[in-house]
């Protein structure tokens, strides 16, 4: 039997049953999430659920740039240090880059400091690049 790999939207890349779109537009976190949703297919800002997934994404983004942080789908909507993925995935894998205390930082970004393998919290109104994800 020939098993066809699902195709992703033009400009998106495929990895392990998911499609990812990296957008080098500047958006705040909530506008980035709305834009991800606007692409359909159940897309959201990306959840990153394993080191393998993180490494694949980091390698892809490093081919474009190495200095700008990128919004992902992790946030703290009630401002209670109870972080959650916007797509409903379980918050099990974590790759924070150390402590980040105070300052109303309730949205997560992939940090350029460690080649996009680790995350930092930031103020949700910052305008940054963003990464979307959906399952085709």
């Amino acid at each position: 039997d020939i098993i066809m790999r699902p195709s992703c939207a033009p400009g998106w890349f495929y990895h392990k049953s998911n499609c990812y779109g990296y957008f080098r537009k500047l958006r705040n976190w909530s506008d980035a999430e709305l834009e991800c949703q606007s692409y359909g297919n159940g897309a959201h800002l990306a959840s990153i659920l394993s080191l393998k997934e993180a490494s694949t994404i980091a390698e892809y983004i490093s081919g474009y740039q190495r200095s700008q942080p990128i919004w992902i789908g992790l946030h703290d909507p009630q401002k209670r240090q109870q972080w959650q993925w916007i797509d409903g995935a379980m918050y099990l894998y974590r790759s924070w880059s150390g402590k980040s205390m105070g300052g109303n930082k309730h949205c997560a970004e992939m940090s350029s400091n460690n080649n996009f393998l680790t995350w930092s919290s930031n103020e949700c109104n910052k305008r940054q690049h963003f990464l979307c994800k959906y399952r085709p």
Partner: antibody
Amino acid sequence: EVKVVASGGILVQPGGSLKLSCIVSGFTFRSYIMSWVRQNPEKRLEWVAEINDGGSYTHYPDTVKGRFIVSRDNDNNILYLQMNSLKSEDTAMYYCVRHGSNGYDYFGMDYWGQGTSVTVSS
Amino acid sequence: DVLMTQTPLSLSVSLGDQASISCRSSQTIAHRNGITYLEWYLQKPGQSPKLLMYKVSNRFSGVPDRFSGSGSGTDFTLKISRVEAEDLGLYYCFQNSHLPPTFGGGTNLEIK
């Protein structure tokens, strides 16, 4: 050493107002979520207010919503609880509490003050 | 609101024996992120409550390893493997997964 010292509790008449204060030291106050928890004379504990690190987000249970206001002064390390339209059922020991966190995770209410007693009675 | 029900209300235990306190919630207290923010507090006579356990089974720093927490969904248990005199007091469970956070009614541990 972490210190959490609440004050302001007194005897007040029903319908009256009161402002509790909590002065903290020994940690970076502006980095932590803070709450007020009360314990009634029957020893029941009730969470009554919470405020995030920056002071821009608050949460209350229905029992005090619209009557109590939590606020904070991050420059002077003070947590406040403004209590209005007080009722007899607000009679309790009020504790000022720190929420343990590293910014990415919540570890429980790790430091409690000694409490300040509020009695609402005519 | 999530109702937290503790049993028993009172517990009398001999020194060195095991004590077990149950806490049941009226609905599942797993947060939508998958973590269960269930805590246990001990209030010794004349003192403020102190944190014992967080996220069901994690001991707070300085808490002896004779204390252990377990459970999931709606049923949770705090066990003290060998009760010591300093363990007497009021034990409270607390859920912080859903607003408003709520406490159990308390269990009074006495030493026989």
